[in-house]
Interface confidence: medium
């Protein structure tokens, strides 16, 4: 999937962007609001009646190298007893980020975006039953 | 990929950190995207904590929309259908990467961007403070 | 996408145990909730269990329960079913089948299935 290019007349002036090869982007890595934090309510993931773990991912070779996904812990939803009903479903809640992937390739290195699909948390749904005739 | 040379030595030489400016293919690597719509749409309906989804636009951007939740309600639907206050409704938000254009409106530079996006809802057993 | 195999089917006596296997293909694997069914010769296919992505959450058919055991192992993308005193009556084409969703999978719509692999109960 290629990078959209908005109508040209939105442009600056070429001169006035920095050149760049055919078929490639220039990608400053530096990251503008890294510092950012998310400020969910405490706990959630245990508190919610669709719970879930989290596993982080390492790749040396993603930037960023890790990346957190969740996992419903149960395929019902916790009842106000406690209890695991079926009757409703625990399903995952994603979302895509991009990610910039380094290749070898013999004593070279190249680039490369990637989308990841990022499962967030989950949450608790009426199931879609079919009637099978 | 756009391939770049290393150093003479390069077996020697792996370099653990990813350099601060990269040249990367235009085309985006998107193996990993699975999502179904028509899977996972109806989630924001079908939840016992659902929410809207509002469309955010930005040029400057890729992706240029991205979708935000806002959760309908402060408690979570029962069992009737109801309202049920001793629960909450939160968001679940996610710190995502984007590209951001920069220097602005050139085609092919940009630069990596972190933001907060709330993706969906979830209920909650509420915090109850007892106050002495 | 997820690819489905199943293997470990086979010829058992009356009584006796098998393991069905079912490797998947896919990064995501720990991500779907995966399951087993069955289709007798004639009948329409039946719901043996399913298994939650971190493996905390099994359900089972209820008629099959005590009998069969269904765990999985994140690390090796692998799905197991060990089936215990079996009866001519469990002779089926077993297939392992995967979705993000146990609603659907619990009703037989899901998004991924194996091609199955056939058990065949006789003495």
């Known amino acids: 999937r290629k990078i959209p290019k908005v109508g040209h007349t939105f442009f600056q002036k070429p001169e006035s962007c920095p050149p760049v090869p055919g078929g490639s982007m220039k990608l400053d890595i530096g990251i503008i609001n890294e510092n950012q934090r998310v400020s969910m309510s405490r706990n959630i993931e245990s508190r919610s009646t669709s719970p879930w773990n989290y596993t982080v991912t390492w790749d040396p070779n993603r930037y960023p190298s890790e990346v957190v996904q969740a996992q419903c812990r149960n395929l019902g939803c916790i009842n106000a007893q406690g209890k695991e009903d079926i009757s409703m479903n625990s399903v995952p809640i994603q979302q895509e980020t991009l990610v910039v992937r380094r290749k070898h390739q013999g004593c070279s290195v190249s680039f490369q975006l990637e989308k990841v699909l990022v499962t967030v948390g989950c949450t608790c749904v009426t199931p879609v039953i079919h009637h099978v005739q | 990929g756009i391939t770049i040379p290393r150093n003479p030595g390069c077996p020697n030489s792996e370099d653990k950190n990813f350099p601060r400016t990269v040249m990367v293919n235009l085309n985006i690597h998107n193996r990993n995207t699975n999502t179904n719509p028509k899977r996972s749409s109806d989630y924001y309906n079908r939840s016992t904590s659902p929410w809207n989804l509002h469309r955010n636009e930005d040029p400057e951007r890729y992706p240029s929309v991205i979708w935000e939740a806002k959760c309908r309600h402060l408690g979570c639907i029962n069992a009737d259908g109801n309202v049920d206050y001793h629960m909450n409704s939160v968001p679940i938000q996610q710190e995502i990467l984007v590209l951001r254009r920069e220097p602005p409106h050139c085609p092919n530079s940009f630069r990596l961007e972190k933001i907060l996006v709330s993706v969906g809802c979830t209920c909650v057993t509420p915090i109850v403070h007892h106050v002495a | 996408d997820v690819q489905l195999v199943e293997s470990g089917g086979g010829l058992v006596q009356p009584g006796g145990s098998l393991r069905l296997s079912c490797a998947a293909s896919g990064r995501t694997f720990s991500s779907y909730v995966v399951g087993w069914f069955r289709q007798a010769p004639g009948k329409e296919r039946e719901f043996i269990g399913a298994?939650?992505?971190?493996?905390?959450?099994?359900y089972y058919a209820v008629s099959e329960k005590g009998r069969f055991t269904i765990s999985r192992d994140n690390s090796k993308n692998t799905l197991y079913l060990q089936m215990n005193s079996l009866r001519p009556e469990d002779t089926a084409v077993y297939y392992c089948?995967?979705?993000?969703?146990?609603?659907?999978?619990?009703?037989?719509?899901?998004?991924?299935w194996g091609q199955g692999t056939l058990v065949t109960v006789s003495s």
């Open positions: 089948t995967a979705d993000q969703e146990f609603g659907y999978l619990r009703f037989g719509r899901s998004e991924y």
């Open positions: 298994i939650s992505g971190s493996g905390e959450s099994i």
